[in-house]
């Protein structure tokens, strides 16, 4: 059974992930972002189901495309280099899902824009955090 300290650690990691995703979304939605139209042409795979930490596998599998899109954005829209942001997310995701068994992600048939993709994972983080608090 998870201890209170492991639950707290999970909560903090989810909050960190949430902040990183929100930072990316805010940087993209910045009204001064001239690359937004181009960024919205990139398609992302959405998870069929995202209700447990193991489903973060689906986010992990989209990190490289996410980095590619962020590289289009003006760097001043972000506090960190896109690569550093994505690497931070990579480390947190691995820590959070960290299970022995490999979970094979199932994707929805419809692809999504980067904004829809980020909103989906932001909602996921918020939902899991709410169950921990």
């Amino acid at each position: 059974a998870p201890t209170s300290s492991s639950t707290k650690k999970t909560q903090l990691q989810l909050e960190h992930l949430l902040l990183d995703l929100q930072m990316i979304l805010n940087g993209i939605n910045n009204y001064k972002n001239p690359k937004l139209t181009r960024m919205l042409t990139f398609k992302f795979y959405m998870p069929k189901k995202a209700t447990e930490l193991k489903h973060l596998q689906c986010l992990e599998e989209e990190l490289k495309p996410l980095e590619e899109v962020l590289n289009l954005a003006q760097s001043k829209n972000f506090h960190l280099r896109p690569r550093d942001l994505i690497s931070n997310i990579n480390v947190i995701v691995l820590e959070l899902k960290g299970s022995e068994t490999t979970f094979m992600c199932e994707y929805a048939d419809e692809t999504a824009t980067i904004v829809e993709f980020l909103n989906r994972w932001i909602t996921f983080c918020q939902s899991i955090i709410s169950t921990l608090t």
Partner: antibody, heavy 118, light 108 residues
Framework: EVQLVQSGAEVKKPGESLKISCKGS????????IGWVRQMPGKGLEWMGI????????RYSPSFQGQVTISADKSISAAYLQWSSLKASDTAMYYC???????????WGQGTLVTVSS | EIVLTQSPGTLSLSPGERATLSCRAS???????LVWYQQKPGQAPRLLIY???SRATGIPDRFGGSGSGTDFTLTISRLEPEDFAVYYC?????????FGGGTKVEIK
Amino acid sequence: EVQLVQSGAEVKKPGESLKISCKGSGYRFTSYWIGWVRQMPGKGLEWMGIIYPGDSDTRYSPSFQGQVTISADKSISAAYLQWSSLKASDTAMYYCARQQVAGMLDYWGQGTLVTVSS
Amino acid sequence: EIVLTQSPGTLSLSPGERATLSCRASQSFSSSYLVWYQQKPGQAPRLLIYGASSRATGIPDRFGGSGSGTDFTLTISRLEPEDFAVYYCQQYGSSPLTFGGGTKVEIK
């Protein structure tokens, strides 16, 4: 279970060409980088380069740029490392590994021993 | 490129003892990019620690990583017989990805 299975050991002569393979299974092959690492006899690890099978984006270490070619065939979940003209100094164990975006090599193949000798 | 220097080159210890391995970088980078591997003779390397301090799946908690900037440490709190091996640090803070020269932990 994530697995990377490499092709068997090779014995070649200087000047010959060679292509070794790495087949991935148990995960979405197109969503992760595959890296190649050289280990010369009794020596440490050297990163050669990476390929992202999803779009064939390839990056090389400056030390290996122009010396080898990294490629992939996503239809069969395979990555390749090839030489057009081998040298005796290419004798080494070559490993493929799945590489996360932050750089950690989390799953490794068993290695392919390449021996180049006249 | 970032050069990683590992010390000592060889560490001679007995089972049950504590091992402290050092990895020093020629320039500073985010700890997200620091990784440790273990390699036993005739085997492929195995991921131990990523993000400087996070244990990989299935790695016992006697293995611990710490550090930031240019100085990183791998600690094995109590050496087990199966821990005698070569340990490599690795960075990807900037391209190319580089490895340290390795530290061999041998039985005293």
